[in-house]
């Protein structure tokens, strides 16, 4: 398969400039005010110094103004996500001005040339904003720049060059190549707006990272760790198109940031919450589900303004499609003894039973190892709202599913052929809901039976004293 390069291209493609023409090419940036929810409508073009289109097209000086800034393009046409985002903004903010920044001629270049054009496009947007500020009632505080990929850094330049401070910049998977590790004035950064929030959906620690890995905003949200997005695997992509390629996977994961933002606009009754954490591994362990001291936030449009002294990295899990919201649970399992564990880690599954619904069988991901006489923390998440939890079924999977584990089991058997059965003792499970911040303790149904072994299950019910809710802040945030 070809090596992916960008949102819709391959590494070798970037070496080919679009064909030269005999027609003079204007290095142009256009501002298209989307005056209708109908995506086919041509809209109104705004230009600095020309006030008539503002009147003719009913530009609302007192309303919010969104500028949507696309990224690098190999086709020279707007990508299909654009009118989804325009439509979602119109649906959510009926009186708002939605402006599409068309810099296609400058983006339809070698990637390196498009990167070098970001500064001039940022200048153009800043000039437009400076001109609009001369009008009565127009406030820079009402301006929200939304930039995708390379467009996120264009937004950063615009925020940097404008006279004053724009209200908000949202970076949707800001481009990585040529920006990773760059000086703050040469990329999107927190000082480019009053509030800079960022969604990272295609970051890779190996190979080429299409999206930037480093935090570049006041809050930087890494859905699913910021790398492998559900529904974007080769198998998923192959299922939806006949000739699925790595390129399609790249596009799916990179573009997921846009869809998460659209979801936050149109499904505001199903907000997704992210939780502050130092890294993805700690989040996967379930350690970071706190909402104390602004440690959690809504993602996308509904994000609550947070201006931290340091970048705040936040994590969450999502579904494979809209609505993306899942329900996160921290599970603390205290293992107070175990027998004959050998070399291999157990494979545990839990099923949660609630007042609204029951979960599917959920795997407990062991990030490091099961510790004895210690509390082991896990993250599980469900796609449906289970309501109040009533009971938990913990299952230790019997037969090994991996050849590696099977080999270790076999080796363990050879060295200790009469090894008695492996066994763990668990008395209680403490559960915390990320979404409600409620904490519950579950005890084994039979206090005498606390042991679990491969192929067996253990049932837990709410302990008699087990309905506890610590005085923590719930993540419900005020919508903007």
């Amino acid at each position: 398969s070809p090596v992916p390069f960008g949102p819709e291209g391959r590494l070798e493609d970037k070496l080919h400039k679009p064909k030269a023409t005999q027609t003079e090419v204007k290095p142009s940036v256009r501002f298209n005010l989307r005056t209708s929810k109908d995506p086919e409508h041509e809209g109104c073009y705004l230009s600095v110094g020309h006030s008539q289109p503002l009147e003719d097209c009913s530009f609302n000086m007192t309303a919010k103004t969104f500028f949507i800034i696309h990224g690098w393009t190999m086709s020279g046409i707007f990508e299909n996500w654009l009118h989804k985002l325009v439509s979602a903004l119109h649906t959510r903010e009926k009186d708002a001005n939605v402006v599409v920044v068309d810099w296609l001629p400058l983006a339809h270049q070698l990637y390196t040339d498009a990167v070098n054009n970001t500064r001039v496009v940022g200048h153009s947007i800043a000039r437009m904003l400076d001109w609009l500020q001369e009008k009565d009632d127009f406030s820079l505080g009402n301006v929200h720049l939304i930039g995708y990929s390379l467009g996120a850094h264009v937004a950063g330049y615009a925020g940097n060059f404008v006279k004053g401070t724009v209200g908000r910049i949202t970076g949707l998977d800001p481009a990585g190549p040529m920006f990773e590790g760059a000086d703050i004035h040469k990329r999107l950064s927190p000082d480019d707006a009053d509030f800079v929030d960022v969604l990272h959906t295609y970051t890779r620690s190996f190979g080429l990272s299409i999206g930037i890995q480093m935090p570049v905003g006041h809050i930087d949200i890494y859905p699913n760790g910021g790398d492998f997005q559900p529904g974007c695997g080769l198998n998923d992509v192959l299922g939806s198109i006949a000739y699925g390629t790595i390129t399609e996977v790249v596009k799916c994961e990179h573009e997921r940031a846009v869809h998460l933002f659209v979801d936050s606009l149109v499904n505001q009754d199903k907000p997704s919450f992210a939780f502050q954490c130092t890294d993805s591994n700690r989040f996967k362990k379930g350690i970071c589900l706190s909402c104390r001291k602004n440690r959690c936030n809504s993602i996308g449009y509904n994000a609550k303004k947070m201006r931290n002294k340091r970048n705040s990295k936040m994590y969450l899990k999502t579904r494979a499609g809209m609505p993306f919201r899942v329900y996160h649970y921290q599970m603390k399992i205290h293992v107070f003894s175990y027998k004959n564990m050998g070399e291999i880690e157990p494979t545990f599954y839990v099923t949660l039973y609630g007042t609204n619904a029951d979960s599917q069988t959920l795997p407990l991901e062991i990030v490091e190892r099961i510790e004895q006489n210690a509390t082991n923390t896990f993250l599980v998440y469900t796609e449906e709202d289970l309501g109040d939890l009533l009971k938990i079924q913990l299952t230790w999977e019997g037969a090994s599913q991996s050849w590696y584990n099977l080999w270790k089991e076999f080796r363990s058997y050879l060295s200790q052929p009469r090894n008695p059965g492996r066994e763990l003792n668990i008395r209680r499970i403490r559960v915390k809901s990320g979404e409600t911040q409620r904490k519950l303790t579950f005890c084994t149904e039979d206090p005498e039976n606390t042991s679990i072994s491969p192929g067996r299950e253990l049932w837990f019910r709410k302990c008699r004293d087990g309905w506890r809710m610590k005085n923590e802040t719930s993540p419900t945030v005020e919508l903007p």
Epitope: T23, K26, P39, E42, L82, S240
Partner: antibody
Framework: QVQLVQSGSELKKPGASVKVSCKAS????????MNWVRQAPGQGLEWMGW????????TYAGDFKGRFVFSLDTSVSTAYLQISSLKAEDTAVYYC?????????????WGKGTTVTVSS | DIVLTQSPASLAVSPGQRATITCKAS??????????MHWYQQKPGQPPKLLIY???NLASGVPARFSGSGSGTDFTLTINPVEANDTANYYC?????????FGGGTKVEIK
């Protein structure tokens, strides 16, 4: 009303060049892209490429790179298709068709077509 | 490039009857809930004319006898009831990605 008016039929010898024009009226020329479509006798429709009428940047489909050039004169809202080193297989009807920059990009307005015949 | 396969290649229908043309794409032409599939009618000696856009939306001035349906890779154009002046070639087109491609066409004749 919105219309695209194309230049008249052309009879050319192999090796010659031809320039077909497409004049737009009834709308803002630079607000829509201009596409070129070829239809050989008794055949289907074949997209040749398009030109961004604001920036002047052309994009050519795979089979139309080299001898085919799209250009503009925005002052008279006109797009041009020039074919050089004509061959017998270039004999076809050439259509211009506009498409929006936004939305689903279908071709909502077509010119009547220009027949180019290449014969010795 | 996305390949569009139309069937049948030709069709003879009596006035008042229903004509159905199908178009199969080599990969999905849907984006979210939108289908980037369109239908054109081309009468002899005339340019193509837009009939249906986005799979099922009737273009301006097109009679309601024409309808479109489908999603993903399978789309249908239906003419019901067929009239004498519907003799033409009908083409499907996808615009989900460049290059936009056309089906091979279906010739509809009225008996």
């Amino acid at each position: 009303q919105v219309q695209l008016v194309q230049s008249g039929s052309e009879l050319k010898k192999p090796g010659a060049s031809v320039k077909v024009s497409c004049k737009a009226s009834g709308y803002t020329f630079t607000n829509y892209g201009m596409n070129w479509v070829r239809q050989a006798p008794g055949q289907g429709l074949e997209w040749m490429g398009w030109i961004n009428t604001y920036s002047g940047v052309p994009t050519y489909a795979g089979d139309f790179k080299g001898r085919f050039v799209f250009s503009l004169d925005t002052s008279v809202s006109t797009a041009y298709l020039q074919i050089s080193s004509l061959k017998a297989e270039d004999t076809a009807v050439y259509y211009c068709a506009r498409r929006g920059y936004y939305g689903r990009r279908y071709f909502d307005v077509w010119g009547k077509g220009t027949t180019v015949t290449v014969s010795s | 490039d996305i390949v569009l396969t139309q069937s049948p290649a030709s069709l003879a229908v009596s006035p008042g009857q229903r004509a159905t043309i199908t178009c199969k794409a080599s990969q999905s032409v849907d984006y979210d809930v939108d289908s980037y599939m369109h239908w054109y009618q081309q009468k002899p000696g005339q340019p193509p004319k837009l009939l249906i856009y986005a799979a099922s939306n009737l273009a301006s001035g097109v009679p309601a006898r024409f309808s479109g349906s489908g999603s993903g890779t399978d789309f249908t154009l239906t003419i019901n009831p067929v009239e004498a002046n519907d003799t033409a070639n009908y083409y499907c087109q996808q615009t989900i990605e460049d290059p936009p491609t056309f089906g091979g066409g279906t010739k509809v004749e009225i008996k």
